[in-house]
Interface confidence: medium
C-alpha cells in the first residue's frame, strides 16, 4: 500500500516566499513520520524535512540552506519557504514516510508543484537627465 499525495500544480512566489501544502491519503495523527520536500525532476535536492514522533516536538529543518518552516495537519504538511531566489524556480515534490506503527509506508510519487519565483522588483530612482549637449 502506498500513500497518495496531492499538491497544487503551480505556485508563484511573488515575495520570494511560498506555502506548499502536501495533502496525504493518510492520517498522520499519532504516527511517527518523516515528511520532506524535494527539488528538481530527479528530486536530487532535499529542501526541507518535517519529522514527528511521540517523544519530542515536531522537528523542521533544511540541510541544504533553504529557509523553511512546517506545519502539521491531520492529513497534510505545509512547507513554508522563504528567501527563495529566482533561480530556484523548479518543480518540487512532496514525500512522506511513516515509520511507526508498522508497516513502513511511503508515497506514490506525486505530480509535483512548479514553484515560479518572481524576484522583488525594487523601484529604480528617478533618472534626471544631465544638461543637454548642443
Amino acid at each position: 500500500n502506498k500513500i497518495l499525495v496531492k499538491q497544487s500544480p503551480m505556485l508563484v512566489a511573488y515575495d520570494n516566499a511560498v506555502n506548499l501544502s502536501c495533502k496525504y491519503s493518510y492520517n498522520l495523527f499519532s504516527r511517527e513520520f518523516r515528511a520532506s520536500l524535494h527539488k528538481g525532476l530527479d528530486s536530487a535536492v532535499e529542501v526541507c524535512v518535517v519529522y514527528g514522533n511521540y517523544s519530542q516536538q515536531l522537528q523542521v529543518y533544511s540541510k541544504t540552506g533553504f529557509n523553511c518552516d512546517g506545519k502539521l495537519g491531520n492529513e497534510s504538511v505545509t512547507f513554508y519557504l522563504q528567501n527563495l531566489y529566482v533561480n530556484q524556480t523548479d518543480i518540487y515534490f512532496c514525500k512522506i514516510e511513516v515509520m511507526y506503527p508498522p508497516p513502513y509506508l511511503d508515497n506514490e510519487k506525486s505530480n509535483g508543484t512548479i514553484i515560479h519565483v518572481k524576484g522583488k522588483h525594487l523601484c529604480p530612482s528617478p533618472l534626471f537627465p544631465g544638461p543637454s549637449k548642443p
Epitope: 495523527f29 499519532s30 504516527r31 511517527e32 514527528g52 514522533n53 511521540y54 517523544s55 519530542q56 516536538q57 515536531l58 502539521l72 495537519g73
Partner: nanobody, 120 residues
C-alpha cells in the same frame, strides 16, 4: 501537583451521545496542549484527539473523525470531548492527558480515566 480529573462517562446506547470533561489544575492550562486517549478492555492505549493550547488546531484519529469533537475552555481550566453517534467499539476508559510535544502521542501526565460503555 498536576491533577487531571475526568468525568462524564457512563452507559449509553449505540447512536447516543456523551460529553466528557477534564478539570485540570497544578499547571498553566492555557499554555498546555491537551489530548484524549482511550483504552478498550484488553487493548492498548489509543490516541483519540489532540488540541493545541489556544484551541486553534485539533487532530482526530480516523476511528472518531466526524463523530467526536475536542474543545477547551481556558477560563475554566477544562478540556471537553463531545462524543456523538457512539458505537460499541467506543467502549473504553477515556483518559485526559497533558501533551507537551504536539499532536502525536507523547504525554507527561494523564488522569485516572472515566469509563464509557456503549451497549444496548
Amino acid at each position: 501537583e498536576v491533577q487531571l480529573l475526568e468525568s462524564g462517562g457512563g452507559l449509553v446506547q449505540p447512536g447516543g451521545s456523551l460529553r466528557l470533561s477534564c478539570a485540570a489544575s497544578g499547571f498553566t492550562f492555557d499554555s498546555a496542549n491537551m489530548s484524549w486517549a482511550r483504552q478498550a478492555p484488553g487493548k492498548g492505549l489509543e490516541w483519540v484527539s489532540w488540541i493545541e493550547s489556544h484551541g486553534g488546531q485539533t487532530f482526530y484519529a480516523d476511528s472518531v473523525k466526524g463523530r467526536f469533537t475536542i474543545s477547551r475552555d481556558n477560563s475554566k481550566n477544562t478540556l471537553y470531548l463531545q462524543m456523538n453517534s457512539l458505537r460499541a467499539e467506543d467502549t473504553a476508559v477515556y483518559y485526559c492527558a497533558k501533551s507537551p510535544f504536539g499532536p502525536l502521542y507523547g504525554f507527561d501526565y494523564r488522569g485516572q480515566g472515566t469509563l464509557v460503555t456503549v451497549s444496548s
